[in-house]
Amino acid sequence: DTHKSEVAHRFKDLGEEHFKGLVLVAFSQYLQQCPFEEHVKLVNEVTEFAKTCVADESAENCDKSLHTLFGDKLCTVATLRETYGEMADCCAKQEPERNECFLQHKDDNPNLPPLVRPEVDVMCTAFHDNEATFLKKYLYEVARRHPYFYAPELLFFAARYKAAFAECCQAADKAACLLPKLDELRDEGKASSAKQRLKCASLQKFGDRAFKAWAVARLSQKFPKAEFAEVSKLVTDLTKVHTECCHGDLLECADDRADLAKYMCENQDSISSKLKECCDKPLLEKSHCLAEVENDEMPADLPSLAADYVESKDVCKNYAEAKDVFLGMFLYEYARRHPDYSVMLLLRLAKAYEATLEKCCAAADPHECYAKVFDEFQPLVEEPQNLVKQNCELFEQLGEYKFQNALLVRYTKKVPQVSTPTLVEVSRNLGKVGAKCCKLPEAKRMPCAEDYLSVVLNRLCVLHEKTPVSEKVTKCCTESLVNRRPCFSALELDEAYVPKAFNAETFTFHADMCTLSEKEKQVKKQTALVELVKHKPKATKEQLKGVMDNFAAFVEKCCKADDKEACFAEEGPKFVAASQAALA
C-alpha cells in the first residue's frame, strides 16, 4: 500500500516516542562519532518535519523517501569530513547509493571509550532531573557502539532500563537493587547485539536464501505443530523485517515487526501453543517474548522422513519441480523432529541432502544412488556431539577462567596473526559457552553451544574483515556460513607463522594491576598469555601453565607488598627471565 508521505505514514504507525527513538538509533548507528547533542538536534528537526507531513501529506518534501530525508539530514553535519574522512564522500552520491555508502562505513569496532558507570546516586539524580534525556543518552551510547543492534529490540532494552531506574532509585538500598539489573541488561544487550550481527552478516554476505534457510530451521524447531505453509509465511515476513533493520531502514523494520507480532498473536492456533503468555504483553515486550519463546511440543505422530525423502521414487521429480521448496520442506520436516540439533547442523544436513540429490538425480539409477543418504548424515551429527561432549568435560574440569585460557592457547596457535585484543575478546566469549550451555540437559546442549559459537565466531569474522591479517580466517569466514565453526575447529597450529620477537614491554606490569577488578585482571593475564603463545607457538600446555602460575604468584605477591610499585619493578624482570628460560 503506497502512501503519499512515507515519513507521515511511519510517524502515525509508530507514534512520536518510538519514531524519535528509532531515528536517534539510526543516526547514532550511522554517525558513531558525533556528539549526543548534535544527534538530538537532528532528531528534533526530523520529528518537527514529520509532524508537518502528518498535518499535510502534500507539503513540500513530504513525498521524499526516508533514505533521502535522513541522508540529507546526516549530510548537514558540519564536521563530517574532519570526523569521518572518506565517509563524507557518501554525501556526493544519490540514493540508493548514498545509503549503501553509509552502511559500508558502519564501524563494528569504533574507537570509543568504554562506558564507565557512575555512582548510583549520580545516575539516579540524572534520571530524576531529566528522564527523557537520560534515556535518549542510553539509546545513543548503545547504538553508536553497536551499529547493527536490532533497533526495535533496543527500544525494549531502553524501556527495561527506564523501569530499573524508576524502581531502584526509590529503594532503600539503591545499589543493591540497581546494579544487578544493569549488569543483566549489559550482558543481555551484548548477546542481543552479537546475535543480530550474525543475522545481518548472513543477509549481507550470503544473501537472503541463507537467512531464510536459517529461519526455516529455527522456526520449525520452535513451532513443530505449524504447517510448512505457515512457517514459510513467518520466514518471509521475518526476512523482510531483518533485511530492513540490517539495511538501516529502522522505521519500516519496527513497523513490520509490530505487524508480524500482531499476525502471530491473531493466528496462535496454527502456530504454537506457547504464544499465549506473550500476546497479552505490550508491543515491545510482546515482540521480544515471541522472539525468545520456547519450543512447542513436537506432534506425537510424526512419520519417518525416509518415506518421502529417501524411499519414494519421486524424489528427483519433486526436487526438479521446485528445488528450493522441496529442500525447504525437507529442512522443515527435519528441524521440527530435531530440537536437539543446532540450527547450523540442520543446515549442514540440508546442504548434504541437496548435494546428494544434485549428484544422484543426474544418475541413471537415482534411487539406488540416494538410498543411503541418511547414513551419510551420521558423521555430520556426531562431529558437533563429540565437540560439545569434549569441551563440556574440559569446562567442568577447569572452570571458566582456565577453560578460556585453554581456548586462548588453542585459537592463538590456529591464527596467531590475529590481533591480541581480538583473540582475547573472542576466546573469552567462546569460553562462556561452558557456563551458558554445559549445565543444560543433553537434548539442549548442542543447539545452545553450536549456535552460540556461530555468533561468537561471526564477531571474529566481522573484526577480521575490517583488518584482514590471516588467509585462514578469511577462508573460514567466507567459504560457507554453516561450516564456519567446523572450519575453525579443524584449523591446526600454523606452521608457516614466524614467531613474534620477544618484547619485555609487553610483560612489564605496574601497581595499578592491584586495583583492577577481577575481570580486568583476567584480561591482563590473558593478554600476556596470548603474547606468550605468539612468541612461542610450540610451547606445551605444561610450559604455559607453569609460566601462568608463576605470573599469578608474582602479581599476588606484589599486590600484598607494602611498596607495590617497587615490588613490580624488582620482581617483574625476574618473572620475565624465568619465563623465557622456562619456554626456551
Partner: nanobody
Framework: QVQLVESGGGLVQPGGSLRLSCAAS????????MSWVRQAPGKGPEWVSA????????RYAETVKGRFTISRDNAKKTLYLQMNSLKPEDTAVYYC????????GSQGTQVTVSS
C-alpha cells in the same frame, strides 16, 4: 512449472519399430537423470529404462533389454526411446519421468502392438 510432453506413439505390427520423444521444459533438464515408464491397461506402472544426465549411463528392464534404446539430446531438452522388435506385450501408455519415478506426471503416448 515442470512439463513433460510425450509423442511418437501409434499402432504398429509385431516386429515393427517406433521412436518416442519426450520434450521437457520448466527445469534444468541437463541436470537430471530421466526414465521411461509404461502402464498397460489394468496394470500398475512398470519402469522401462533410465539414462543419466550426461547420457553415458543407461539401464533397462529385463523385458526390453536388447530391443529398446534410451537416449537424450540436452541441447534440445528431449528424451528418446527407440523401440525395435516390438511385441504385443509392449502395448501400453508410455510416459517419461524425472529420475526413477514411476508416478505419472504427464499424459503419455499410447503404443499399440497388434497384427
Amino acid at each position: 512449472q515442470v512439463q513433460l510432453v510425450e509423442s511418437g506413439g501409434g499402432l504398429v505390427q509385431p516386429g515393427g519399430s517406433l521412436r518416442l520423444s519426450c520434450a521437457a521444459s520448466g527445469f534444468s533438464f541437463g541436470s537430471f537423470g530421466m526414465s521411461w515408464v509404461r502402464q498397460a491397461p489394468g496394470k500398475g506402472p512398470e519402469w522401462v529404462s533410465a539414462i543419466d544426465s550426461g547420457g553415458a549411463d543407461t539401464r533397462y528392464a529385463e523385458t526390453v533389454k536388447g530391443r529398446f534404446t534410451i537416449s537424450r539430446d540436452n541441447a534440445k531438452k528431449t528424451l528418446y526411446l527407440q523401440m525395435n522388435s516390438l511385441k504385443p506385450e509392449d502395448t501400453a501408455v508410455y510416459y517419461c519421468t524425472i529420475g526413477r519415478s514411476t508416478s505419472r506426471g504427464s499424459q503419455g503416448t499410447q503404443v499399440t502392438v497388434s497384427s
